[in-house]
Amino acid sequence: EPCVEVVPNITYQCMELNFYKIPDNLPFSTKNLDLSFNPLRHLGSYSFFSFPELQVLDLSRCEIQTIEDGAYQSLSHLSTLILTGNPIQSLALGAFSGLSSLQKLVAVETNLASLENFPIGHLKTLKELNVAHNLIQSFKLPEYFSNLTNLEHLDLSSNKIQSIYCTDLRVLHQMPLLNLSLDLSLNPMNFIQPGAFKEIRLHKLTLRNNFDSLNVMKTCIQGLAGLEVHRLVLGEFRNEGNLEKFDKSALEGLCNLTIEEFRLAYLDYYLDDIIDLFNCLTNVSSFSLVSVTIERVKDFSYNFGWQHLELVNCKFGQFPTLKLKSLKRLTFTSNKGGNAFSEVDLPSLEFLDLSRNGLSFKGCCSQSDFGTTSLKYLDLSFNGVITMSSNFLGLEQLEHLDFQHSNLKQMSEFSVFLSLRNLIYLDISHTHTRVAFNGIFNGLSSLEVLKMAGNSFQENFLPDIFTELRNLTFLDLSQCQLEQLSPTAFNSLSSLQVLNMSHNNFFSLDTFPYKCLNSLQVLDYSLNHIMTSKKQELQHFPSSLAFLNLTQNDFACTCEHQSFLQWIKDQRQLLVEVERMECATPSDKQGMPVLSLNITCQMNK
Amino acid sequence: QKQYWVCNSSDASISYTYCDKMQYPISINVNPCIELKRSKGLLHIFYIPRRDLKQLYFNLYITVNTMNLPKRKEVICRGSDDDYSFCRALKGETVNTTISFSFKGIKFSKGKYKCVVEAISGSPEEMLFCLEFVILHQPNSN
């Protein structure tokens, strides 16, 4: 069976084709080659001689047991080599010779027992080394690591490392890899020698499900003393063994580390006193809790010095009390419990993401809700009922506002966005908004992107609601049940580049409303019920138009519509997916491509 | 279409068939077997994925006695610092995991329950596997 040509001469997918040898019928120019799940078993020298341009080679699960010297010789452009799931028994010293550009080596689940005899010391370009899910017992980083000066990611998770000694990291003292991210999760650790990490700098250290008791965790974290780490991730996994006990003593050792960002990811334990628990983390710049249960929500009003707080997929009794002077970014998403939003006091806040919480807001939105006048980004999408009772007084700095898939109330009672002269991006898609007031978008003089799909308009008619949006470049009016529009609805949108009118209910096409759209490049009228044109002769669309989508409409392919059908043919160079422009009527022409019709008036009169 | 039996409990019989062409082998064990009136147990899965499990989610299409419920999307792996350790599993890496589950207080009417599970993962998104579970429910007291 032949390989699948994904990109001609470049990318070939030969997965699971029962190949016993490397195929020799693929072009020399091949850059990406997937040979995974083939029983190759043995790689001799110059195995890939026919593919000198290879950049990515996937050999996952190829039952490879032996890799000989120079197996990859000639692959001087290879940047990614994947060997996952091969039961390697014999790896020659020169197995990886010739890989002068290799940046990513994945040797997950390859029976690797030690880094010491892994022959990769010459791979100076290596950025990522993934040796997870192996049999490595020692964390000693061999001397050859001093050659790997570009290494940024080292994944040693799911190995057999139990202890870390001072001598294990000696090589990092000699040549500090300032950007190294290290994942040691799922190693059964019980000892870290104090001083082992002293004066070591890491970009990221991940330790999840490493400790089988609170005491072990406590002593191991104390063993990290002296480490300077940009981002520290601690925690567990839901499907692995979890700690039976967890208290403030667990993290006391963190006081002896220098940490810029901290994350606790999944803990099968109720956190009650977070002030004591995170006592050593009051001054990290970014603090993050993922998938934890928090009992006492008042604790977030303590004087933590965090600039970024992230609470994701957590459980709360009620919406937390948030009073944090220095906080600039708050991400509070996909959380459970506390369904009603309560005011927060965050005077420095610039970025607020409250999406996907099922929250309801009794009154939105003004400075008093968030306790800040500095807010630039606000995401309230995928929540419950949000009642608009104020038009963003004190929030005039906003540039990005997202309400999609929340249920907005009182949107047509006053000019909700009147204060937002700096707003650039607004998404009110699928918010149950019924536009019944022409001043709905008044004030949005800087707006560039407006997404309002999935809403509705009074009498299914689009009125002149965009008159102030002179900077608008993107407008989505899809799925709005629109049937008619004001001939001057778009007259002020001279900067508009993309207009989506798809999935509405137009019976006819009219070019007149678009005559002022001098910058329009994309117009999507797909999934309407267009049968013909409006009475008058169709004019040309603006000359800037490059893409016109009229697919999945109800074209009436009869003689009376000859001029419209001819006009469509004349637009051929603009039309996208023309094969999906089909006649709907009459019955003998149903399903025929509109552009293949011979439009002469022998069509049945 | 070959049917794979999972288990029987006091009020349910569970089996599955593949609903994709690939039919890559997957081993599923439930211990103890699910009882629909209330249940607590362990789900054990052994599987070698044909693509990375990063950003794994399930589309669930549930049918209750021929009545279709709306499609449900269950996100399992968000993409970074995920809850489950198998979210970091790579294409070709053995996934051998045990997941605990529990539910209570749901009353099910007698009949045939079908659940099509479409597993989608990776970037770009592609189907990982598709299984159609059939649960025959025989409540002892309803």
Epitope: N460, F461, Q481, H503, N505, F506, F507 | -
Partner: nanobody, 119 residues
Framework: EVQLVESGGGLVQAGGSLRLSCVAS????????MGWFRQAPGKERDIVAR????????YYAESVRGRFTISRDNAKNTVYLQMNSLRPEDTAVYYC????????????WGQGTQVTVSS
């Protein structure tokens, strides 16, 4: 399942009038487009008129424009076709059609009602 039942057809003299009715049952179709097609002997089936759920938009084939009027009563789940100034060439079987609530065009069809215009 949606069912469309037409009534009101019959024999009429040229210049006369008829009013066709179509009742939808099985589910409410108040938001979907509905319409009338016709098929004359030896000819293909073609659209005569169409009306949106809101009654705001209508479409008429050129041959009936000014003579036929489509309307609907959503409370009664009914669509009508008032046919005036009938001509012999209007003789056909008239079919009621409805889109699906998901927006698929011409999804549901009635059995048809015969209209015969004698000269």
């Amino acid at each position: 399942e949606v069912q469309l039942v037409e009534s009101g057809g019959g024999l009429v003299q040229a210049g006369g009038s008829l009013r066709l009715s179509c009742v939808a049952s099985g589910r409410t179709l108040s938001t979907v487009n509905m319409g009338w097609f016709r098929q004359a002997p030896g000819k293909e089936r073609d659209i005569v008129a169409r009306i949106s759920g809101s009654s705001i938009s209508t479409y008429y084939a050129e041959s009936v424009r000014g003579r036929f009027t489509i309307s609907r009563d959503n409370a009664k789940n009914t669509v009508y076709l008032q046919m005036n100034s009938l001509r012999p060439e209007d003789t056909a079987v008239y079919y009621c059609v409805a889109d699906s609530p998901g927006g698929r065009s011409y999804e549901y069809w009635g059995q048809g009602t015969q209209v015969t215009v004698s000269s």
